[in-house]
C-alpha cells in the first residue's frame, strides 16, 4: 500500500481543516488508514482522524481544530496499521479556504433597487471576520448568457443594484462567495443560491 498523491490540506481558519490524498489502488480509507495530527507545541497531544473514501483510491479527512492562529503548525502522519506511509506538516494560515457565506437574501421591496444581504460565516472574534471580501454571482434562469459577477470589496455583507440593470419579468438567481486577501486565501465555495422574480416599473417613454 502506497500513497500516490500526497495529502494536501486546507483550513477554514476556524475549526476544520480538510486533507485529501490518493492511494495507489482502491482503498477502504476508514478501515485501513489513520491520519494523526498534532500541533507543534510542548503540551499538545496527538489527535486521530478517520478518513472517508473520496472516489475509489481517494481519501479525505476532516481534522478538528479548536481554533487557529497564524503561527500554528501541525505535524501529519498517515498510518496504515503499524506502517507509516507518509509524514508531513501543515500550517493552516498558509492554506486557507474560507467558509461559504450564508443566509443570502434578496430584498425586492426597495423602490426599484435590489438589496442583496448575506451573513459573514465567521464570529466577530475570528481574525477573518473583518477581512473578507465577496463576489456575488447573478444569472438568469432563462438566458445562460445573462451571467454577471459583482465584486464587493468593502466589509459590509450586502450589495445594492438597480433592478433595471437586470431584465424585467424574468427569474434570476444569486449566490455569493468569499475570500480574504490578508492570507491570500482561495475562494470559498458558493453559498446556496436564492431565486427571485425581477420586476420593476419601466420609465415612461416620451415621444
Amino acid at each position: 500500500m502506497k500513497v500516490l498523491q500526497e495529502p494536501t490540506c486546507v483550513s477554514d481558519y476556524m475549526s476544520i481543516s480538510t486533507c485529501e490524498w490518493k492511494m495507489n489502488g482502491p482503498t477502504n480509507c476508514s478501515t485501513e488508514l489513520r491520519l494523526l495530527y498534532q500541533l507543534v507545541f510542548l503540551l499538545s497531544e496527538a489527535h486521530t482522524c478517520i478518513p472517508e473514501n473520496n472516489g475509489g483510491a481517494g481519501c479525505v479527512c476532516h481534522l478538528l481544530m479548536d481554533d487557529v492562529v497564524s503561527a500554528d503548525n501541525y505535524t501529519l502522519d498517515l498510518w496504515a496499521g503499524q506502517q507509516l506511509l507518509w509524514k508531513g506538516s501543515f500550517k493552516p494560515s498558509e492554506h486557507v479556504k474560507p467558509r461559504a457565506p450564508g443566509n443570502l437574501t434578496v430584498h425586492t421591496n426597495v423602490s426599484d433597487t435590489l438589496l442583496l444581504t448575506w451573513s459573514n460565516p465567521y464570529p466577530p472574534d475570528n481574525y477573518l471576520y473583518n477581512h473578507l471580501t465577496y463576489a456575488v454571482n447573478i444569472w438568469s434562469e432563462n438566458d445562460p448568457a445573462d451571467f454577471r459577477i459583482y465584486n464587493v470589496t468593502y466589509l459590509e455583507p450586502s450589495l445594492r443594484i438597480a433592478a433595471s440593470t437586470l431584465k424585467s419579468g424574468i427569474s434570476y438567481r444569486a449566490r455569493v462567495r468569499a475570500w480574504a486577501q490578508c492570507y491570500n486565501t482561495t475562494w470559498s465555495e458558493w453559498s446556496p443560491s436564492t431565486k427571485w422574480h425581477n420586476s420593476y416599473r419601466e420609465p415612461f417613454e416620451q415621444h
Epitope: 507545541f41 510542548l42 503540551l43 499538545s44 497531544e45 479548536d66 492562529v69 497564524s70 503561527a71
Partner: antibody, heavy 116, light 110 residues
Framework: EVQLLESGGGLVQPGGSLRLSCAVS????????MSWVRQAPGKGLEWVSA????????YYADSVKGRFTISRDNSKNTLYLQMNSLRAEDTAVYYC?????????WGQGTLVTVSS | QSVLTQPPSASGTPGQRVTISCSGS????????VNWYQQLPGTAPKLLIY???HRPSGVPDRFSGSKSGTSASLAISGLRSEDEADYYC???????????FGGGTKLTVL
Amino acid sequence: EVQLLESGGGLVQPGGSLRLSCAVSGFTFSNYAMSWVRQAPGKGLEWVSAISSGGGNIYYADSVKGRFTISRDNSKNTLYLQMNSLRAEDTAVYYCAKLRRYFDYWGQGTLVTVSS
Amino acid sequence: QSVLTQPPSASGTPGQRVTISCSGSSSNIGNNYVNWYQQLPGTAPKLLIYDNSHRPSGVPDRFSGSKSGTSASLAISGLRSEDEADYYCGTWDASLSAYVFGGGTKLTVL
C-alpha cells in the same frame, strides 16, 4: 464567556499541604492544555506547572518539582494543584490559566499564605 | 533573577510612544514565540500580544509587538492613563522545558 474560578487557598503552616481547584466554563475544557502561574506579594509572575488536554504531558518549574502535582478532571471541567511540603517562599496568589502557546485566559487567583 | 530581562520601569506622558524591551537567549526568545501580558493594579494578568505580534480581539491597535533574534519589544503609542500597569513578556524555554517570564516593567503615565 470564558470563566476560570480558583478556590482552595488559605493559610497553612510550613510543611503543610493544600489543594487548589480551578473550575472552568465557557470553552471545551478537555480540548486545551491548562497551567498554574503564581505571583508572590509585590513580585512578578512565575510559571508553576502545566498539563496537556488529556493529561498525558505534564511539566513543572524546578522550584516546585517533587512537591506539587497538577491534575485535571475533564468530566468535571476542573483543574487541580496538590501542594505538599509547603514553604514560606510558596506564599503567592495562584492563578489558573488556559494555555495555548500563551495564556489567553486567566482566573482571578486564590491567595496561599505559608506561615507559622 | 528572571530568565528574560526587562527594564523594571518605564514612563511617558499621555499621547507619547513608549517601548518596553525583553531580552533572552536562543533557548527561549530565539526559537520561540514571545507573548506580552498586561496586569492592571489589583487585577489578574491579561494577554496583550501573542506569537510575537498578534493582538487578541479587544486589544487596541495602539499596542504592538515585535521580535528580532533573542530580543522582543512591546510598543505602546498614544499613551493613555489607563495604560498604567505592569507589563510582562513570556515565552517557552526549550532547555528548561518551562514557560519563563520577564521580571516585569512598571509603566507610569506621567
